[in-house]
Amino acid sequence: HTAAQDNCTCPTNKMTVCSPDGPGGRCQCRALGSGMAVDCSTLTSKCLLLKARMSAPKNARTLVRPSEHALVDNDGLYDPDCDPEGRFKARQCNQTSVCWCVNSVGVRRTDKGDLSLRCDELVRTHHILIDLRHRPTAGAFNHSDLDAELRRLFRERYRLHPKFVAAVHYEQPTIQIELRQNTSQKAAGDVDIGDAAYYFERDIKGESLFQGRGGLDLRVRGEPLQVERTLIYYLDEIPPKFSMKRLT
């Protein structure tokens, strides 16, 4: 595949092994951990990225740490089971046979149970709220400039069509990006909002998943936008099923 025809690398996923063994000697890349072939013209699914992250040698994972700011995704990292298309399997279990159900972005949505736990379907996360706080600047950013820049970023860097960026809210210093995507809204080739949010989260943390591309350099009318904290909220099409004990 193209970007890397000369040196055969995957521009959208550095956690891959690539070789020119595809049809006609073309570059083909496989995700670390799973060995699954990935399409390097678009984002790799979050499930395959997490699996690759967990399979990487410990000394190569200097940047890996659970986010101290995570609100919903507070179970930290785990080695997920992915289906043949790279999506999270509805039921995830660890090595000690503790199991739980996850949503389409891999976040736990039930209490933990044993191997008898049933997760009938993979519940879709259809609304993601990315809550950012930016570092102090000389003045507030212009809201429409900020909106346009974030839509451009999500399209050009993460390939997410602007139709899925439902809104950009701004009350200095807080920026909220709302991503919305129902199953029926996704057309052929459309990026999943969960994958786009994950790439964005990693970029914001300085842990870019892109190969050879510079880190995220967000500017609004030339003024750097530097993020000092990120919270990501996930809303599922079907509400999660936690016991009252956990909620209290």
Epitope: A3, P11, T42, Q185, K186, A187, G189
Partner: antibody, heavy 119, light 108 residues
Framework: QVQLVQSGAEVKKPGASVKVSCKAS????????MHWVRQAPGQGLEWMGE????????SYNQKFKGRVTITRDTSTSTAYMELSSLRSEDTAVYYC????????????WGQGTLVTVSS | DIQMTQSPSSLSASVGDRVTITCRAS??????LNWYQQKPGKAPKLLIY???RLHSGVPSRFSGSGSGTDFTLTISSLQPEDFATYFC??????????FGQGTKLEIK
Amino acid sequence: QVQLVQSGAEVKKPGASVKVSCKASGYTFTSYWMHWVRQAPGQGLEWMGEITPSDNYTSYNQKFKGRVTITRDTSTSTAYMELSSLRSEDTAVYYCARGHGNYVSFDYWGQGTLVTVSS
Amino acid sequence: DIQMTQSPSSLSASVGDRVTITCRASQDISNYLNWYQQKPGKAPKLLIYYTSRLHSGVPSRFSGSGSGTDFTLTISSLQPEDFATYFCQQGYSLPPYTFGQGTKLEIK
């Protein structure tokens, strides 16, 4: 096989409106973007707008300043493009084309509809 | 909007020749560049998408390369049916998606 069949040629007076249809078959209509592209005689290609038939989302080329409206009827797998306030420079062949969300490549095209604007 | 510039605007070649058409974008478009072939009175046909991927049914004599702002379409050995007009198109940015002005390939 994928087919996009467009309505026939139209002759319109300046100031009038025209509505061109594009009937899709051979694939799931709601699973792909549909785009409209025009080509003036002897000229290049110009993107006009897009629709996702599943949810009726549209976006347009600002050049047309609200003159273009793209709609769809999922029951008949048909997309429509309406252009209003016609002027002579809108004389062109209008194409519908199926699009891919990531590459934004247009992999199948209708046969084209010639719209002539003349007083 | 991103401007796409093709060169040459026309060229003459013979059957069996190797032909190269170039397309330049006014800003970096990564690899989101597509090529189309159009014959007189017909709709365009997709040849290559994402810089170098051949659309189904397109002969292997067509190839594409490039990245960033500079791209090329190469026909390794011209066949009689290849005489047509070729357009490049970017799908990188927010809409509008833009095309090159076209390159007319004629028989010498």
